[in-house]
């Protein structure tokens, strides 16, 4: 028949009893049985007694009574009763268990780790139990990650089980740390602490600290140092393999450095005394941590005696460029042991010559290369203890990018102006290594007569290469080149002679060599205005006349031309704009802005200024003109006409100079008839002079001049007598 499982006197899966009380638990079964108790309950303890007896009907059953006197909190756990000698496959029917809480208000946790935390090993991705089980099922426990984080049970990832503690179903690195279970009982806070610790198999780095390859003379000692770096919670095994391993030629020492707060450093040092040729070959350091593995190799070369070989790396003549931050002059050297290295420049120790020379291995580094670094460089190699010496020389050419000297010394903020029609000489002096070639280019200015934009000369225009026969732009007289020693350097001077300056544009001289190209732009602006800025007053007007001023500026040098009137108000000079550039007339070389003030009055007197802005400097330039409007004044003659006699066929002049404001108009009359200009009769400037060519007797008579303006008129007359009359006259 089927065996019925043992029965416990306390029913259910769990039971709570108070600390200090006696726990009674009886097991009744159909076969001999034994008790399984919490580890903290010692079967030898005087507190514990287990009494066996026959029981049941006819005494056919087996009974066992467990008595635990003065039960303690740490006795909390599973108490189970199971049959002896029953196959494990039927365990369920052969065992009965109950979880008994021994409740102690002074000890909520079964295991207390308050002073020294308990270490729990964890594996990421696996279940992690924080075993802060309690002595009473109704104690509320909080799980904290020291000091600020609380892990809240969610019934899935974090589960609270009063018999086990906190179960974290899928532990991550975030659970690594000091985890504290906290419970408050009767106003007292109790804590039990756990340190979760993750053992890793990470190998961060493996290195052999000696240079690669390792070179030794026969009979010397070989020392190889292998270093493995790992996280703090990793341990490693380090092994070596090497050529004469079978004869155990090497001795190996190991040590660990844990002084770094973030990593462990493991060292394995291999030593072979008095190396032989058989010790040459590959040495491998192998590092293993669980499944992780890393290795590192080095080659060991054994030499019989010291030697040096030295060759040019490329060619014997080397080239570099002035201005280079650093140039490495190096030779191909094979030597052992390492020789002493000295570099000579033109026969003298280089590093003593200049602080810019540094020796690095078999190389000479020249910092901030200059032209003076050109020369012969010799490497001297010596192994003095073995009396081995070698040297080799290389020539260094330092190429220099062309420089144009006029470019460096030019201090003009804005371009020069070249008078229209003038002959001009333009020069560029260039230096470079190799010697640069100089060519001249011409770029005409863009003439833009739209109102929106000023005429300008920009780099956008097409550039033309010039030669003496070029018919582009201005007529060229010649392009010549000569060598000149300036500041001790052989420089090339190129001169362009412009025969007839007519077209504005940009001349460029371009100096080129294999290092590079440099250009100088010469703005060649033609001016038909003296100094590129001229103000003109047609005449000083009188009241009622028109004031006519004109301002002419070079159109490539100036913009924003405006006429302004300067007025002084309370000791301050005020500028009143009276015309703008939009009224200006643009011509080939200049802009003219005319100002006309009609019918002026005395109040129009003042300082008139033409203002323009220099395109290059942005500076505003003023040219002033004082204008004084004169009062109207009736004409008056400076000298009256006087009678005079003139020989026939000769010429004569009559002057009628009058002043007045406005300037009087002069009218001539002869015998009261108005004289018009005709062949033989010429009216001079402003009609103030009457000139009669080849006088005839008809020219005799009363001559009358009249000066008239708005204020009145004045007249004067005189008789002109013609002498040496014709026969007719003589007869009379």
């Amino acid at each position: 028949s089927k065996l019925k499982g043992p029965e416990l006197s306390l029913k259910g899966t769990q039971h709570v009893t108070q600390a200090g009380q006696t726990l009674h638990l009886q097991c009744r079964g159909e076969a001999a049985h034994q008790w399984s108790l919490p580890e903290t309950v010692s079967k030898e303890s005087k507190r514990l007694s287990i009494t066996k007896s026959a029981c049941g009907r006819n005494g056919k059953q087996f009974c066992s009574t467990l008595t635990l006197n003065a039960a303690q909190a740490n006795h909390t756990g599973f108490y189970s009763c199971k049959y002896l000698a029953v196959p494990t496959s039927k365990k369920k029917e052969t065992e009965s268990a109950i979880y008994i809480f021994i409740s102690d208000t002074g000890r909520p946790f079964v295991e207390m780790y308050s002073e020294i935390p308990e270490i729990i090993h964890m594996t990421e991705g696996r279940e992690l139990i924080i075993p802060c089980r309690v002595t009473s099922p109704n104690i509320t426990v909080t799980l904290k990650k020291f000091p600020l984080d609380t892990l809240i049970p969610d019934g899935k990832r974090v589960i609270w089980d009063s018999r086990k503690g906190f179960i974290i179903s899928n532990a991550t690195y975030k659970e690594i740390g000091l985890l504290t279970c906290e419970a408050t009982v009767n106003g007292h806070l109790y804590k039990t602490n756990y340190l979760t610790h993750r053992q890793t198999n990470t190998i961060i780095d493996v290195q052999i600290s000696t240079p690669r390859p390792v070179k030794l003379l026969r009979g010397h000692t070989l020392i190889l140092n292998c270093t493995a770096t790992t996280p703090l919670n990793t341990r490693v095994q380090m092994t070596w393999s090497y050529p004469d391993e079978k004869n155990k030629r090497a001795s190996v020492r190991r040590r660990i450095d844990q002084s770094n707060s973030h990593a462990n450093i493991f060292y394995s040092v291999l030593t072979i005394d008095k190396v032989q040729n058989k010790d040459k070959g590959l040495y491998t350091c192998r590092v293993r941590s669980g499944p992780s593995f890393k290795s590192v190799n080095t080659s060991v070369h054994i030499y019989d005696k010291a030697f040096i070989t030295v060759k040019h790396r490329k060619q014997q003549v080397l080239e570099t460029v002035a201005g280079k931050r650093s140039y490495r002059l190096s030779m191909k050297v094979k030597a052992f042991p390492s020789p002493e290295v000295v570099w000579l420049k033109d026969g003298l120790p280089a590093t003593e010559k200049s602080a810019r020379y540094l020796t690095r291995g078999y190389s000479l580094i020249i910092k901030d290369v200059t032209e003076e670094d050109a020369g012969n460089y010799t490497i001297l190699l010596s192994i003095k203890q073995s009396n081995v010496f070698k040297n080799l020389t290389a020539t260094l050419i330092v190429n220099v990018k062309p420089q144009i000297y006029e470019k460096a010394v030019s201090s003009f903020p804005d371009p020069a102006l070249y008078p229209l029609g003038s002959r001009q000489i333009l020069t560029c002096t260039a230096y470079g290594i190799p010697r640069p070639t100089i060519k001249w280019c011409w770029r005409p200015c863009n003439h833009n007569h739209s109102e929106a934009r000023y005429d300008f000369c920009s780099n956008n225009e097409e550039s033309f290469i010039l030669d003496p026969d070029s018919n582009i732009g201005n007529r060229i007289e010649s392009i010549t080149q000569r060598m000149a020693i300036i500041e001790g350097k052989n420089k090339t001077a190129s001169t362009l002679v412009v025969a007839d300056s007519r077209i504005s544009g940009i001349y460029s001289c371009i100096a080129s060599n294999k290092v590079g190209t440099v250009g100088r732009n010469i703005s060649f602006y033609i001016t038909d205005v003296p100094n590129g800025f001229h103000v003109n007053l047609e005449k000083m007007p009188t009241e009622g006349e028109d004031l006519k001023l004109s301002c002419t500026v070079n159109k490539f040098l100036y913009r924003d031309v405006t006429w302004i009137l300067l007025r002084t108000v309370n000791n301050r000079t005020m500028h009143y704009s009276i015309s703008k550039q939009k009224m200006a007339i643009t011509k080939e070389h200049s802009i003219t802005l005319n100002l006309t003030i009609m019918n002026v009055s005395l109040e129009d007197s003042g300082t008139y200024a033409c203002r323009a802005r220099n395109v290059y400097t942005g500076e505003e330039i003023l040219q002033k003109k004082e204008v004084t409007i004169r009062d109207q004044e009736a004409p008056y003659l400076l000298r009256n006409l006087s009678d005079h006699t003139v020989a026939i066929s000769s010429s004569t002049t009559l002057d009628c100079h009058a002043n007045g404001a406005p300037e009087p108009q002069i009218t001539w009359f002869k015998n009261n008839h108005k004289i018009q200009q005709e062949p033989g009769i010429i009216l001079g400037p402003g009609s103030s002079t009457l000139f009669i060519e080849r006088v005839t007797e008809e020219d005799e008579g009363v001559y009358h001049c009249k000066a008239t303006n708005q204020k009145g008129s004045v007249e004067s007359s005189a008789y002109l007598t013609v002498q040496g009359t014709s026969d007719k006259s003589n007869l009379e």
Partner: antibody, heavy 119, light 111 residues
Framework: EVQLLESGGGSVQPGGSLRLSCTAS????????MNWVRQAPGKGLDWVSS?????????YHVDSVKGRFTISRDNSKNTLYLQMNSLRAEDTAIYYC???????????WGQGTTVTVSS | QSVLTQPPSASGTPGQRVTISCSGS????????VNWYQQIPGTAPKLLIY???QRPSGVPDRFSGSKSGTSASLAISGLQSDDEADYYC???????????FGGGTKLTVLG
Amino acid sequence: EVQLLESGGGSVQPGGSLRLSCTASGFNFEDYGMNWVRQAPGKGLDWVSSINRQGDISTYHVDSVKGRFTISRDNSKNTLYLQMNSLRAEDTAIYYCTKNHDYHGMDVWGQGTTVTVSS
Amino acid sequence: QSVLTQPPSASGTPGQRVTISCSGSRSNIGNNFVNWYQQIPGTAPKLLIYLNSQRPSGVPDRFSGSKSGTSASLAISGLQSDDEADYYCASWDDSLNGWVFGGGTKLTVLG
């Protein structure tokens, strides 16, 4: 290399405000609780505020700054903040930003930023 | 007034052993771990001891910590001139819900 760099200190009048920042580098910022600790001139260390790693559950402040100072963090910028309002003369100190270790206390400290409150 | 109590000063000659005490209450030292910090003048504090007695990597074994009940102590043996600094004890305080520090002990190395 693990580093904390504070900024935002300066001089302010009583009643004024300042915002201190602490930029972290060399470690996974979001995995660690952070703190502000201050040291008045010639005096000892005083804890000011703490914030847990998530920055949305637990923040703690010393009583003397409660209601005036707020600790916060932006894990995306690896930055810890301390917003200080209604500043008083007794708040004058060097303010250190510190990181909590998994097992240790405050294992990394910044170089500090000076806050001066005076009229 | 600091929550944890430390002597304001301590001194010793090179090679000597010096002990600095730190006393608190159940809510801090009694129920939590103690940390010790060293602060060399003009620099930020540095963690010296954690979990009552553990040394971070790089801290010499001349420094040791212990805790008993609501008190803790830091011992420095084989005193050296570069140990001259301010030493602070610290602990979490459950009542204040924050860190508490001792007032600091200025250690002078004589001679």
